[in-house]
């Protein structure tokens, strides 16, 4: 398992929500990316093929997500002070093997000017 | 250690119809797409149908589209094979398999469907 | 469909010498660098085992006497010093495209 800082811009803000983007090389054809703040699964997100190469996508915890063919992005909205904390993208690569996990994050730091409904 | 147990064969008349079962142990079922393979006596191997995680995406040979359904059922760790108006020509033995993301790496020891009056 | 052929229908190879199985599919297996193209030995009365996969990756536990070559149509499985053990019918099989196919298989004896 690799654990390690983000090394790209992670948290992309709007609209009072927040994009948290997981990346993943373009090689990678399947894996399960989960979403972990602190140590808690927040989202997850499985792609995988069959044996005619059909591809399925499958969500066991139920988040905005949405994939490119490098990266998964899942999007956190209603932002308060609460949503501040460690955010880990946990990457598990099935295919091609071997099989790896890799860990990356970031702290998500919550300003005013970024939440959703300020009290004026 | 993987293991996948075969039930549910026997002799059937033309027309007849029998469910295959699998059960699955020593994995997360649920990770995992699965197949059912035949191999008729004394022949090749023959892919038949598959089935993804959780049964939304199903594919079948043409050969035994409209006649055979496949489902599972993840809380017993269970794959179907739900075979009707059988023929002759569906005489084999039926091996379920794990696909392993790219590969059956694990397959059952078969159970024998004969269709025969 | 694609078609998967194989060649010979069997061979008888003594032991200790080298054993080669050609599969061929009817079209491409090649997608974004990898070859979708498995084999699987069969010994009687038993389920198959699977060799290779993605063409020349050998399966963990399987010895280094197997290989897998080849690229786009054209797979070869070699056994490069035959033991009795390797006695077996040898099946590939495509995953590029539904439905998956697997060739005839090659029967595999002691000469």
């Known amino acids: 398992e690799i654990n390690g800082s983000a090394n790209y811009e992670m948290f992309i803000f709007h609209n009072g929500g927040v994009q948290i983007l997981c990346k993943y090389p373009d090689i990678v054809q399947q894996f399960k990316m989960q979403l972990l703040k602190g140590g808690q699964i927040l989202c997850d997100l499985t792609k995988t093929k069959g044996s005619g190469n059909t591809v399925s996508i499958k969500s066991l915890k139920f988040c905005h997500s949405q994939l490119s063919n490098n990266s998964v992005s899942f999007f956190l909205y209603n932002l308060d002070h609460s949503h501040a904390n460690y955010y880990f993208c946990n990457l598990s690569i099935f295919d091609p093997p071997p099989f790896k996990v890799t860990l990356t994050g970031g702290y998500l730091h919550i300003y005013e000017s970024q939440l959703c409904c300020q009290l004026k | 250690e993987v293991q996948l147990v075969e039930s549910g064969g026997g002799l059937v008349q033309p027309g007849g119809s029998l469910r295959l079962s699998c059960a699955a142990s020593?994995?997360?079922?649920?990770?995992?797409?699965m197949d059912w393979v035949r191999q008729a006596p004394g022949k090749g191997l023959v892919w038949v149908s598959n089935?993804?995680?959780?049964?939304?995406?199903?594919n079948f040979a043409p050969s035994v589209k409209g006649r055979f359904t496949i489902s599972r059922d993840n809380a017993k760790n269970t794959l179907y094979l739900q075979m009707n108006s059988l023929r002759a020509e569906d005489t084999a033995v039926y091996y379920c398999?794990?696909?392993?993301?790219?590969?059956?790496?694990?397959w059952g020891q078969g159970t024998l469907v004969t269709v025969s009056s | 469909d694609i078609v998967m052929t194989q060649s010979p229908d069997s061979l008888a190879v003594s032991l200790g010498e080298r054993a080669t199985i050609n599969c061929k599919s009817s079209?491409?297996?090649?997608?974004?660098?990898?070859?979708?193209l498995i084999w699987y030995q069969q010994k009687p009365g038993q389920p198959p085992k699977l060799l290779i996969f993605?063409?020349?990756t050998r399966e963990t536990g399987v010895p280094d006497r197997f290989s897998g070559s080849g690229s786009g149509t054209d797979f070869t499985l070699t056994i490069s010093s035959l033991q009795a053990e390797d006695v077996a019918v040898y099946y590939c099989?495509?995953?590029?495209?539904?439905?998956?196919?697997f060739g005839p298989g090659t029967k595999v004896d002691i000469k």
């Open positions: 089935i993804d995680h959780d049964g939304n995406i199903i």
């Open positions: 079209q491409s297996l090649l997608s974004s660098g990898y070859n979708y």
């Open positions: 020593g994995f997360t079922f649920s990770d995992y797409w």
């Open positions: 398999a794990r696909w392993g993301h790219y590969a059956f790496d694990s």
């Open positions: 993605y063409a020349s």
């Open positions: 099989q495509h995953h590029y495209s539904s439905p998956p196919t």
